[in-house]
Structure formats: structure tokens, C-alpha cells
Interface confidence: low
């Protein structure tokens, strides 16, 4: 999927744009807002009725190299008594992010943008029940 | 930077870390995933901590459209379909990387930007504080 070039309806291309070879783009990987931190409620992964665990995946040829994935602990949801209620479902909530992938072909190195689907956490849903004749 | 194993047969001039600026292919690898969460699943309506999705659009960013979740209630929906305020709906937030046009308006020059998005909501038992 190509990154859409922005049409002239939005803006004209400034003269100051750096020259870029055809079929590629220049990417500065010094991250804007690098030190921003998530300020989620404390321990929501344990306090949720659809609790989850975290796993860290590590890939030295990916930037960022560390990606954290969540996995729902149960098929059902935890009820007020702390028991699993299988009439409800714990389901993963996912979000896309971008990473930069480094590829080695012989001694040459190329870089590729990649979409990665991250499981962020879980939520408890009422199941869809189909009545079949 | 990130250290990587290097092919021992390659010249030593190769940098072990990611350089600050790279040229990348315009094609983004990995499935044409459906970026509209309203179409990809109806969890936002079926959840006990339902949420609404708000479209955030910025032509200077890729992807230009990001969907932000806002929990509909303070409490969670119980078995009777009513809001139970003994439980809390809370947003699940995630840092994601996007591309920011830099310099602004340039078609093929970007910088990575970290942004915080609320992806959905989950129902949690509240932390109760007893105030004297």
C-alpha cells in the first residue's frame, strides 16, 4: 500500500523539500515525543473483568526493536465473585502501528516501513448468538 | 540506536545501529488492513464498557485518519443492560508510531512521531479510597 501523496487541494509542495529518489522516501527516525508516557489507570490488566498478560517481542532488525503484545487470560469474563463467566467473552482490542524493518541482501541494507498489529488489551463483550433453523 | 548482528563477510563500515535518517521504500509492507475499527469489529458496541469512536484527521500525518475511543459511561453495563457504577469503564491507551511530514507539506519526507491513542475501553474494579 503506497503512502498517498497529498494533492494540491491541501497545499503546494514547498521549494524547501529535500530531493528524494523515485520510489522511496526520506525518513528521520529521531522520534517526536519520544519521552511521552502512557498514563493509564494502575494495573488495569489485572483489575479488568477481561484481564490480560503482556509479552515483549524483540527483533533487532526492527525499529523500535521492542513491541509489547497483550494476551487475554480467559475465554470468558470475571464476574463479581471472581469466577470466570463463560456466557461472556474476553476479546482482544487491537491497534495498528508503524515500524521500520531493516533487510539485509548480501552486504547491502535496505529499509522498509511495515504495519504491525498490536494487541493492546482486552474487553468483555456479550457474545453474538446466531439462531439457526 | 539498536545493535544488530552483522554478516562477518561484510565490510566493517556498516553501522550496527539504525542510522538517524533512512531512505525507505514507499510501499508499506503488511496487508491492507482495515483501519476503520467501526468496520473491523463491533466490540465498541457489545462491550460491557462500550465506547464511541472519533475520527482524528491530519493530512500532515500518515496514517492521516486515526480513530480515538472515548468510553461512553463512567460505570459498566450489567446483565440487565443498566450502568453499574460499582465498576468503572476505563480507556486502554497505546503509544503508536506515525509519520509526520517534515518539512511540513513535503510529499516524500517524514519523521517518526509517537502519539498516544485510546484504542478502546475495559471494565475494571475500582480502587476505592476511603477519605476521612
Amino acid at each position: 500500500r503506497k503512502i498517498p501523496k497529498v494533492g494540491h487541494t491541501f497545499f503546494q509542495k514547498p521549494e524547501s523539500c529535500p530531493p528524494v529518489p523515485g520510489g522511496s522516501m526520506k525518513l528521520d527516525i529521531g522520534i517526536i515525543n519520544e519521552n511521552q508516557r502512557v498514563s493509564m489507570s494502575r494495573n488495569i490488566e489485572s483489575r479488568s473483568t477481561s484481564p490480560w498478560n503482556y509479552t515483549v517481542t524483540w527483533d533487532p532488525n526492527r525499529y523500535p526493536s521492542e513491541v509489547v503484545q497483550a494476551q487475554c487470560r480467559n475465554l470468558g469474563c470475571i464476574n463479581a465473585q471472581g469466577k470466570e463467566d463463560i456466557s461472556m467473552n474476553s476479546v482482544p482490542i487491537q491497534q495498528e502501528t508503524l515500524v521500520v524493518r531493516r533487510k539485509h541482501q548480501g552486504c547491502s541494507v535496505s529499509f522498509q516501513l511495515e504495519k504491525v498489529l498490536v494487541t493492546v488489551g482486552c474487553t468483555c463483550v456479550t457474545p453474538v448468538i446466531h439462531h439457526v433453523q | 540506536g539498536i545493535t544488530i548482528p552483522r554478516n562477518p563477510g561484510c565490510p566493517n563500515s556498516e553501522d550496527k545501529n539504525f542510522p538517524r535518517t533512512v531512505m525507505v521504500n514507499l510501499n508499506i509492507h503488511n496487508r491492507n488492513t482495515n483501519t476503520n475499527p467501526k468496520r473491523s469489529s463491533d466490540y465498541y458496541n457489545r462491550s460491557t464498557s462500550p465506547w464511541n469512536l472519533h475520527r482524528n484527521e491530519d493530512p500532515e500525518r500518515y496514517p492521516s485518519v486515526i480513530w480515538e475511543a472515548k468510553c461512553r459511561h463512567l460505570g459498566c453495563i450489567n446483565a440487565d443492560g443498566n450502568v453499574d457504577y460499582h465498576m468503572n469503564s476505563v480507556p486502554i491507551q497505546q503509544e503508536i508510531l506515525v509519520l509526520r511530514r517534515e518539512p511540513p507539506h513535503c510529499p516524500n519526507s517524514f519523521r517518526l512521531e509517537k502519539i498516544l491513542v485510546s484504542v478502546g475501553c475495559t471494565c475494571v474494579t475500582p480502587i476505592v479510597h476511603h477519605v476521612a
Partner: nanobody
């Protein structure tokens, strides 16, 4: 985009009643949770109450639930606050506010706010 304009404020004697109105512009009024906040002189803005888009869920601050009544008329794009048994401590600027989620409105983080109308309770 929603514009909110409050009216109905004024001077009232202790024990008296007053009805505030909030007229909203925009065709999507019924999709918003709307409510009232108030700010007394020298104090922080506080939540009074709110009502869901359809009007079937109404939320009151515990201290006001017996004296104040919130209602809405979606055909007129209007929110109301009926106040009775007014006391001197009810003197404040009353603000109308709207958001698509009650959770945001409840904690004063609404998307839309009116300019406010002053209610003075004094003999």
C-alpha cells in the same frame, strides 16, 4: 459543532424557584449528553447534573438531587434546570455543557460550553 446559550438567571429570594434554559444550535442535539455545572464566587466549577441524549438517564450531584430537576426537549434543542428551595449557597454562574460521553462531561472535560448565566439567591 454545537453552540450553547443559557438564559433564565437572575435574582431570587431564599426558598424561591427558578428555571434555567439552555438553547443549543445544531441538528445533532439528541446525540449529546448535556448537563449543568456551576461556579460560585471564589470556588471551583462543580457538577450539578446531566441527562443522556434520549433523556432516559439523568445524573444528579448527590447534594442537589432533591431540589433540582434536569430535563430536555429535543424537538426544541433545549436543556432545562428547574431549581427549587433555593439557598444563598446556590448563588453561582450556571453553565450548560455538552459532550458525546457522560464520563467526559462529568469531570468537566466536555467539548462544548455556554457562556453561563448568573443566579443570585439573596433577600
Amino acid at each position: 459543532e454545537v453552540q450553547l446559550v443559557e438564559s433564565g438567571g437572575g435574582l431570587v429570594q431564599p426558598g424561591g424557584s427558578l428555571r434555567l434554559s439552555c438553547a443549543a444550535s445544531g441538528r445533532t442535539f439528541s446525540s449529546y449528553v448535556v448537563g449543568w455545572f456551576r461556579q460560585a464566587p471564589g470556588k471551583e466549577r462543580e457538577f450539578v447534573g446531566a441527562i443522556s441524549g434520549s433523556g432516559d438517564s439523568i445524573y444528579y450531584a448527590v447534594s442537589e438531587k432533591d431540589r433540582f430537576t434536569i430535563s430536555r426537549d429535543n424537538s426544541k434543542n433545549t436543556l432545562y434546570l428547574q431549581m427549587s428551595s433555593l439557598r444563598a449557597e446556590d448563588t453561582a454562574v450556571y453553565y450548560c455543557t455538552a459532550d458525546q460521553e457522560f464520563g467526559y462531561l462529568r469531570f468537566g472535560r466536555s467539548e462544548y460550553w455556554g457562556q453561563g448565566t448568573l443566579v443570585t439567591v439573596s433577600s
